[in-house]
Interface confidence: low
């Protein structure tokens, strides 16, 4: 007898993993044998669609390799012309292990800005996303949050946020890990320790110290009165992202010294500055404070002037007396730029013997000042014109007073060799006798204020007499 179709096993919800096989069964009893058709989301599945296999007279629908897009409602309809067509429907739920569709990438960011590391995922059930920093799970806080999308957002990035990150997508079917990415936090250059201002004596050594940090580690440059530092030695060291720069200066003039720390962020630079002033206290002459020691002269400037292996007084008010006094001679000499050939050797002799004074060793090493007569000989005979010009400039403030005090002693304050021949030092390079004074060109029309011929003659001392003086 003809029998209308009855579906004996209604379709059920089928869970299937991507790339696996999924089968719907639609068992039908009827006579004659029915025609069975299948739809997905109300669209007919064609018999020749190679993605499907329809068997058992149409009662089995097999999806040969499930895709994410196969999700939907599947219905079978049976009709044999007896009675009406019957239908049963079931859902295909495509289950999917987590998959990271937009993984995080390396990020460089400036401290204080917002960083977002993407991590977009797919999966069914929907994966939960967490993040690992280094080897540890990342804890969210007021600054750090995992967004709905799975991306990691860090507000007000701090340098401690730098490191290696990876995202983890997890559902009941499995876990997916992104590759490890690097968050680099760049930090604007910042000065941690600024140079400090100093008030020092002329000719002192001063070390200005500037410490800066930043990521990348900044470079430090020094500016002196608005220009690149022209003299002085710079020592730098870098440790734990801190750069330490020390500028050692030999102070001959006041100045404003600026430490500039610079680092680069992409195409842009950040800088931090700090300044220190160096001012010069009133120069006190070395004789006033006889703290020092005797040592053989080992410098260069005064080699030709001082006796070979001369024992000179080195003033310990300087950090490095030898170098400081040597530089003082250089500096003082440069202040007296244009001098005549007659004056030059005499002035050099005076200068060298004034700065590198002869030293009397003993329990307390003592500097021996130049004898007044020799000082006056330079002032009123060899360098009369130059001396006048220099004194005039000093009075008009064109020379700094400390330079004046430094480069030329005040003759009147020096001991006379007639008081105590051992209390003062001679200038052997000023070898001449009074008979030969006329061989020198007249230097001034004014009468010398001292009886220069009172200098010892060859008959009265060991001071050699010659119309010439050799200085190279």
């Amino acid at each position: 007898l003809p029998k209308a179709p009855v579906i004996t096993t209604p379709l059920e919800t089928v869970d299937a993993l991507v790339e696996e096989v999924a089968t719907f069964m639609c068992a039908v009893e009827s006579y004659p044998q029915p025609e069975i058709s299948w739809t997905r989301n109300k669209i007919l599945i064609k018999l020749f669609d190679t993605r499907y296999s329809i068997r058992e007279n149409g009662q089995l629908l097999t999806i040969l390799s499930v895709e994410d897009s196969d999700d939907g409602i599947y219905c079978c309809t049976a009709n044999n012309g007896v009675g009406g067509a019957v239908e049963s429907c079931g859902a295909l739920q495509v289950k999917m292990k987590p998959k990271i569709t937009r993984p995080p990438i390396n990020v460089k960011i400036i401290e204080g800005l917002k960083a977002v590391l993407p991590c977009t995922t797919m999966g069914n059930p929907k994966p939960s996303v967490s993040w690992i920093k280094g080897d540890s799970p990342l804890r969210e806080n007021s600054r750090i949050a995992v967004l709905e999308s799975g991306s990691l957002r860090i507000h007000n990035v701090q340098k401690e946020d730098a490191g290696q990150y990876r995202c983890v997508a997890k559902n009941s079917l499995g876990t997916a890990y992104s590759k490890v990415v690097k968050l680099e936090v760049e930090v604007f250059a910042r000065i941690l320790r600024a140079p400090e201002s100093h008030n020092v004596t002329f000719g002192s050594f001063v070390t200005l110290h500037c410490t800066a940090t930043g990521i990348p580690v900044p470079t430090i440059t020094w500016i002196e009165n608005g220009n690149a530092v022209s003299s002085g030695s710079i020592q730098e060291s870098v440790k734990d992202r801190v750069i330490d720069s020390r500028l050692q200066l030999f102070i001959t003039k006041p100045g404003l010294y600026t430490c500039i720390a610079t680092n680069k962020h992409g195409e842009k630079f950040s800088t931090a500055k700090a300044a220190a002033t160096i001012s010069i206290a009133e120069w006190s002459k070395p004789q006033k404070d006889n703290k020092g020691y005797c040592a053989q002269y080992r410098g260069e400037v005064c080699n030709a002037v001082l006796a070979k292996d001369a024992l000179v007084f080195l003033n310990t008010s300087y950090a490095d007396p030898e170098e400081a006094q040597e530089l003082l001679v250089h500096t003082a000499w440069n202040e007296l730029k244009v001098v005549s050939p007659v004056c030059r050797p005499a002035a050099e002799a005076l200068l060298c013997n004034h700065i590198f004074q002869e030293c009397s060793p003993g329990v307390v090493p003592t500097p021996i000042p130049i004898c007044r007569e020799y000082c006056l000989a330079v002032k009123e005979l060899f360098c009369a014109k130059e001396w006048l010009v220099m004194e005039e400039k000093t009075h008009r403030g064109l020379y700094r007073s400390e330079m004046h005090l430094l480069s030329v002693p005040e003759c009147s304050k020096l001991p006379s060799m007639h008081w105590d021949p051992t209390a003062c030092a001679r200038l052997p390079h000023l070898d001449y006798n009074k008979e030969n004074l006329k061989t020198f060109p007249p230097m001034t029309s004014s009468k010398p204020s001292v009886d220069i011929p009172n200098l010892p003659s060859s008959s009265s001392s060991s001071f050699s007499v010659s119309p010439t003086y050799s200085m190279t």
Epitope: R190, L192, R193, H198, T211, A272, A275, A276
Partner: antibody, heavy 121, light 112 residues
């Protein structure tokens, strides 16, 4: 959130000693110089002492030199002020303050709430 | 030893402008003194307003500005608000040695 919390204040007799502590949080402690500033009751602020980021040098107001010692423990994120031979004129609220680090003795850009030191017999 | 000087008290009307100054008993204030300004309301810890002459600390309203004028450092409040009534201290960096950082005696500002 940046925080500086002072402790260790109290009543002490003249000639006595106290050690103040300042616990820092919310910033990279070893990146910054620190200072102690005090304020006598009803009076103005007075800088007492400073220490740079690495503790490499220390600075003091003339009147406390030789009696007070500033120090820091970067691992513990703590600043200290050891006060010996206390005098009645040291009575004040002592503030711990973070230096900006940009210049020597730069601006004190964060302050604690202070701890009261009373020197009295 | 140099003393940092400030006006003991000043007053300003709400919305008005007032300038507080900070000088040295001997000599001029220069940028090398890195003038800093602090505000303190009764019972509270001080708060940083201006550092290094003219840099405003984070969170400080733009009505506060710093400068060096003549031989003094100056703090100007443009458009004073009632909440600006407080004690204001300037501090100067005095260079090496002791008493490196010196506060002024403070100015009591009243907003009438």
């Amino acid at each position: 959130e940046l925080q500086l919390v002072e402790s260790g204040g109290g009543l002490v007799q003249p000639g006595g000693s106290l050690r103040l502590s300042c616990a820092a949080s919310g910033f990279t402690f070893d990146d910054y110089g620190m200072s102690w500033v005090r304020q006598a009751p009803g009076k103005g602020l007075e800088w007492v002492s400073a220490i740079p980021w690495n503790g490499g040098s220390t600075y003091y107001k003339e009147s406390v030199k030789g009696r007070f010692t500033i120090s820091r423990d970067n691992a513990k994120k703590t600043l200290y002020l050891q006060m010996n031979s206390l005098k009645s004129e040291d009575t004040a609220v002592y503030y711990c303050a973070k230096r900006s680090g940009r210049i020597a003795f730069g601006a004190l850009d964060a302050w604690g709430q202070g701890t009261l030191v009373t020197v009295s017999s | 030893q140099a003393v940092v000087t400030q006006e003991p008290s000043l007053s300003v009307s709400p919305g008005g402008t007032v300038t507080l100054t900070c000088g040295l008993s001997s000599g001029s204030v220069t940028s090398s003194n890195y003038p800093d300004w602090y505000q303190q309301t009764p019972g509270q810890a001080p708060r940083t307003l201006i550092y290094t002459t003219n840099s405003r600390h984070s969170g400080v309203p733009s009505r506060f500005s710093g400068s060096i004028s003549g031989n003094k450092a100056a703090l100007t409040i443009t458009g004073a608000q009632p909440e600006d009534e407080a004690d204001y201290y300037c501090a100067l960096y005095m260079g090496g040695g002791s008493n490196v950082y010196v506060f002024g005696g403070g100015t009591k500002l009243t907003v009438l």
